[in-house]
């Protein structure tokens, strides 16, 4: 119907416009006219797939009528001025705003010109991630946890460990009606090398410029681990004093030392302090194991050491051990 | 206040042609499409076409494509149809029609009898 | 053509009644629809744009309606000057095209 030879006009507006939830957000929509085509624009009109009746109209005399005034503003159009813009502004974006919406312009002579426009309804997620402290059960468990609140559509969470282990996903409603909430719990096998050691959980989502990282240190709670160093069995009559050290690894730190021997309690030339264990110098060869008992609040556990001191020079003068 | 005011009726002949006038007032002139609309006897109504008073741009009905011409005078914001080769099948009313996408505002009509 | 099938064509009704006219489009026409009223004798008079705003002035009696195909144009408590006839037009494309009318009578 336009006539012959006539250079179309054309209606911009993007295929895909986000918004955030409970905020405000323009669906653009422009009319473009080629340079040497006229056109005159009478008419805008939004209206929604799927609805009745159309949302918002701009009428070239009546001005701008909306199916929910406190909700909708043409952001451009006014009355007598050229209606070439018909960016519509939704207040207060709701879950159910999200669809497919129509831009329509009535022009002369060139007719109805459309454009559609799918608004996405988004929501920011909030991300914590926390360990989940545990004990050496010999089975699998959760060790960490990551949570992304809230999100629309649901955050995508995964895990990045050097430890094995595998994740377990789960979505539930979040507390805002078309929110999701995402948790990822990261189970393993926990042992003692695990605890101290750390995972990452990485969360993406739209609306987030780069993905999310959060660390999260393992606790492994487990009895101690215990060993005796200090002895490299070249300890000699008439040197100075020496030292056994107790190690014990745990989780929770070990609540006391318990030094002994296999005959029972400690001969006089062994003193304990804590952790360590004082050997003074003998004048006679002795051949002792030596138990360092080992308690945290898991239970205790025990390391064993046979120590010998022989007749013969001394190699070093500085003293029995070279510790 | 807006008005469109009509030519008077017209009686005539087969074969004959005839311009029938619409002047405006109460508004810009150059702003708004003028479009014609031909109501025959006891029936509906009948768009004919339009046309920009501004750069002359018109759209017609194909049905009236070679029967009516629109053209306007700005200098009198005066909008006109002319109608050709007419016969019987063109007497009725015709309507001028400030075109908003709807027609907001109508002239009076003109009425066209086409008799021997 | 886009045809708009108005019905009914006539209608009687009583003063304080409520009545509605259909217009059916055979292809989707949007929201692109107005209604007018035609009393007798006089030129056509604009009273619902786009399928469901009043023109300033027109009593809110009248209520349009509908998207699509599918078009309604109610009158609540009607009066004795809406003796009229009623006309359902799409401006969606080229050419425009009128529905066939609905004559209302007052009893």
């Known amino acids: 119907w336009p006539p012959p030879g006539t250079g179309d006009i054309i209606v911009q507006a993007p295929t895909q416009v986000p918004g955030f939830l409970g905020d405000s957000v323009t669906l653009p929509c422009y009319l473009q006219v080629p340079g040497m085509e006229e056109t005159h624009v009478s008419q805008l009109t939004w209206s929604r797939h799927g609805e009745s009746g159309s949302m918002a109209v701009f009428h070239q005399t009546q001005g701008p009528n909306y199916s929910e005034p406190k909700r909708l503003e043409f952001v451009a159009a006014r009355l007598g001025t050229e209606l070439r813009d018909a960016s519509l502004r939704m207040f207060g974006l709701r879950v159910e705003d999200e669809g497919n919406y129509t831009c329509l312009f009535v022009t002369f002579p060139q007719g109805s010109r459309s454009v559609d426009i799918w608004l996405r309804v988004l929501a920011k997620p909030q991300n914590t991630a926390e360990v989940q402290k545990v004990q050496l059960t010999g089975k699998p468990v959760p060790v960490a946890r990551c949570v992304s609140t809230g999100g629309r559509p649901p955050a995508h969470i995964t895990w990045h460990s050097d430890l094995g282990g595998m994740p377990n996903t789960s979505q539930a409603p979040g507390f805002l009606s078309g929110t999701v909430t995402v948790t990822s719990l990261w189970i393993l096998v926990p042992s003692s090398q695990v605890d101290g050691k750390s995972v990452t959980c990485k969360v993406e989502h739209e609306s987030f410029e780069k993905p999310q990282l959060l660390t999260v240190n393992l606790t492994v709670y487990y009895p101690p681990e215990v060993s005796i160093s200090g002895y490299d069995n070249n300890w000699y009559l008439s040197q100075n004093e020496a030292t056994l050290t107790c190690d014990a690894r745990s989780n929770p730190e070990p609540t006391g030392y318990n030094w002994s021997t296999t005959m029972g309690p400690l001969p006089p030339f062994a003193v304990a302090q804590g952790a360590q264990l004082l050997i003074r110098p003998v004048d006679k060869p002795i051949n002792t194991t030596f138990i360092c008992n080992v308690t945290n609040a898991l239970g205790a556990r025990q390391a064993e050491l046979t120590v010998q001191v022989k007749e013969g020079p001394p190699s070093e003068p500085s003293g029995m051990s070279s510790n | 206040e807006v008005q469109l005011q009509q030519s008077g009726p017209e009686l005539v002949k087969p074969g004959a042609s005839v311009k029938i006038s619409c002047k405006t007032s109460?508004?810009?002139?150059?702003?708004?499409?003028m479009h014609w609309v031909k109501q025959s006897h006891g029936k509906s109504l009948e768009w004919i076409g339009g046309?920009?008073?501004?750069?002359?741009?018109?759209s017609y009905n194909q049905r009236f494509k070679g029967k009516a011409t629109l053209t306007v005078d700005k200098s009198s914001s005066t909008a006109y149809m002319e109608l050709r080769s007419l016969t019987s099948e063109d007497s009725a009313v015709y309507y001028c029609?400030?075109?908003?996408?709807?027609?907001?505002?109508w002239g009076q009509g003109t009425t066209l009898t086409v008799s021997t | 053509d886009i045809v708009m099938t108005q019905s009914p064509k006539f209608m009687s009704t009583s003063v304080g009644d409520r009545v509605s006219v259909t217009c059916k489009a055979s292809?989707?026409?949007?929201?692109?629809v107005a209604w007018y009223q035609q009393k007798p004798g006089q030129s056509p008079k604009a009273l619902i744009y786009?399928?469901?705003y009043r023109y300033s002035g027109v009593p809110d009696r009248f209520t349009g309606s509908g998207s699509g195909t599918d078009f309604t144009l109610t009158i609540s408590n009607v009066q004795s000057e809406d003796l009229a006839e009623y006309f359902c037009?799409?401006?969606?494309?080229?050419?425009?095209?009128f529905g066939g009318g609905t004559k209302l009578e007052i009893k």
């Open positions: 029609a400030r075109w908003t996408g709807d027609f907001d505002y």
């Open positions: 109460g508004y810009t002139f150059t702003e708004y499409t």
């Open positions: 046309i920009h008073p501004n750069n002359g741009d018109t």
């Open positions: 292809q989707n026409v949007g929201t692109n």
């Open positions: 786009s399928a469901s």
């Open positions: 037009q799409q401006y969606n494309s080229y050419p425009y095209t």
